[in-house]
């Protein structure tokens, strides 16, 4: 990182760990400037699975990323690729420090560390940077909705972040869907959760200084009866070559017995959609399963024809949930750029 | 406006159960987390015990856990706090109050007796 | 378990005057903190949480301040009918933990 005044006139600091992923502490305001490995060609960055443009305030330009004055919506997970292979050459993730403070000359030099910035941070145990944000600490929601439990902290050494649940380690494998551990935003985030993730959930902060937790309640409200509830994001938006092989996946919670079916969106005469407003399908399967466990819909050797939206829908006898993705087929010879290609996937999620 | 009433309070010799109630009014009961507090004569206030909405998560004080049981029921707005096996030391007002998002007990019953006397 | 501890344990004041209460946290439990007021007879009554939120229909003069291990309640004005025992409580973390009360009484 470097502090400048003229971003045009300024080097660029190269990854200090190529292909490893690097966290950097960015002080408010200030400029940023980093280039993707010894050479500029070839070279494209990304913010959270999105190419940055060439022109603005943020921009990937020449194979560096600068970003003229570091804001907190800039924190986050930026990845370098280098265009031919995809390779990753650097995965980063951007930080905001706003604990930066002034240093008097009278104070002891063996609590202070200095940054490539030029900055000097105090050394500090960790803090919670938002506790407002934390003040919701007894959370009841309905099955089937997301969680998300933050404790937004900071400190130098940057501490790292852990959760427990009911006093245990917890990674989420053992929940259907697992979890999601967002180390930037310091959060917890649990989809389509049940009665069985009900519970104390605690993050513990620590660095070499010290530690602190917090912790929340979640309680989970049953929706007797409910139509099934689906995993958020499967299926997922999903990419595959010509010939090879792909598996989609739907992940239901019900109660009632339900049924699954997949489908997949065709066009009749030129039109989507039929004289009733509903999209024109082909029932691909049809499958009862157990209340969690997983369906998959398993297409081989995939062609060009195979492309186009495919929906899961789950029924019981209350009601209907569907969720829907798309499948883009390429040719050969695009595979090398696109399969890695780190594009933020949508995904439909219906209920009726 | 929240109401929260609580009854079946009364004298008890050691040794002994009574089932206190708390009846909600005013409020979504079925979105709120309830707590059970005592105040033995002349002391402060001592958390006993909570309950989930669902009633699917409990806790306890260390002093009752064991003895008493905290439960709930929806349909007819109520909390409920079964206590067994009683001790002199249980002798206390109890109060039941409603717990905002945040824990705090924004909402308090007027209190019920218990007397546990030989 | 946190412990609170609340100065002094009672306190005698004229009305009008100013009333400054104290609760200490043996750890941090950074602004969550709540305060109650108790009548003779009556049960408690929120008066602050988040360490300085007034709770709903409870007059200015009530005020709180304070995070981490620190906190203070001050009434400003005493009125007659704020003569009572105040309690401090901490929910950051379980089991929560109540002072054991200052005396607010009439001098």
């Known amino acids: 990182l470097e502090a400048s005044e003229e971003m045009e006139q300024e080097p660029c600091l190269a990854p200090i760990l190529e292909q490893q992923e690097q966290v950097l502490t960015v002080a408010l305001g200030q400029p940023v400037r980093l280039c993707c490995g010894r050479t500029e060609r070839g070279r494209h960055w990304y913010k959270e699975g999105s190419r940055l443009a060439s022109a603005g305030r943020v921009r990937g330009w020449r194979g560096r990323l600068e970003i003229a004055s570091f804001l907190p919506e800039d924190a986050g997970r930026y990845l370098c690729l280098a265009r031919g292979s995809m390779t990753v050459v650097h995965n980063l993730t951007l930080l905001m420090d706003d604990s930066l403070t002034s240093i008097s000359n009278d104070e002891d030099p063996k609590t202070l560390s200095s940054s490539s910035s030029g900055h000097v941070y105090p050394q500090q145990a960790p803090y919670w940077t938002h506790p407002q944000r934390m003040e919701k600490k007894l959370h009841a929601v309905p099955a089937g909705n997301t969680v998300k439990f933050r404790c937004p902290a900071a400190g130098n050494p940057m501490p790292t972040i852990h959760w427990l649940k009911d006093g245990q380690a917890f990674h989420g494998e053992n929940r259907i869907g697992g979890i999601r551990l967002r180390h930037q935003h310091w959060s917890l985030v649990m989809e389509s959760v049940v009665p069985s993730d009900r519970g104390t959930y605690t993050c513990l902060v620590e660095n070499s200084l010290g530690s602190i937790r917090y912790s929340y309640l979640l309680d989970v409200l049953e929706r007797s009866p409910h139509r099934p509830i689906l995993q958020a994001g499967l299926p997922a938006n999903t990419t595959a070559v010509v010939g090879s092989d792909v598996e989609l996946l739907c992940k239901v919670y019900s109660d009632a017995q339900p049924h699954i079916q997949w489908l997949k969106h065709v066009v009749i005469n030129g039109s989507s959609f039929g004289a009733d407003g509903f999209p024109y399908v082909q029932v691909l399967k049809t499958t009862d399963i157990n209340s969690s466990e997983v369906e998959v819909l398993y297409l081989r050797n995939v062609s060009a024809e195979d492309a186009g939206e495919y929906t899961c829908l789950a029924g019981n006898s209350i009601g209907l949930s569907y969720q829907s993705a798309w499948l883009t087929v390429l040719p050969e010879e695009d595979l090398t750029w696109t399969t890695a290609t780190p594009e933020a996937a949508s995904h439909h999620h219906h209920h009726h | 406006e929240v109401q929260l009433l609580e009854s079946g309070g009364g004298l008890v010799q050691p040794g002994g159960s009574l089932r206190l109630s708390c009846a909600a009014s005013g409020f979504t009961f079925s979105r709120y987390f309830m707590k059970w507090v005592r105040q033995a004569p002349g002391k402060g206030l001592e958390w006993v015990s909570w309950?989930?909405?669902?009633?699917?998560?409990?806790e306890y004080a260390d002093s009752v856990k064991g003895r008493f049981t905290i439960s709930r029921d929806n349909s007819k707005n109520t909390l409920y706090l079964q206590m067994n096996s009683l001790r002199a030391e249980d002798t206390a007002v109890y109060y039941c109050a409603r717990a905002s998002y945040g824990a705090w007990l924004d909402y308090w019953g007027q209190g019920t007796l218990v007397t546990v006397s030989s | 378990d946190i412990q609170m501890t609340q100065s002094p344990s009672s306190l005698s004041l004229s009305p009008g005057e100013r009333a400054t209460l104290s609760c200490r946290a043996s750890q941090s439990i950074n602004r969550n903190l709540g305060w109650y007021q108790q009548k003779p007879g009556q049960a408690p009554r929120l008066l602050i949480y988040g360490a300085s939120t007034r709770a709903t229909g409870i007059p200015a003069r009530f005020t709180g301040s304070g995070s981490g291990t620190e906190f203070s309640l001050t009434i400003s004005s005493l009125q007659s009918e704020d003569y009572a025992i105040y309690y401090c409580?901490?929910?950051?973390?379980?089991?929560?933990?109540f002072g054991q009360g200052t005396r607010l009484e009439i001098k």
């Open positions: 309950i989930s909405p669902s009633g699917g998560l409990t």
């Open positions: 409580q901490q929910y950051d973390n379980w089991p929560i933990i």
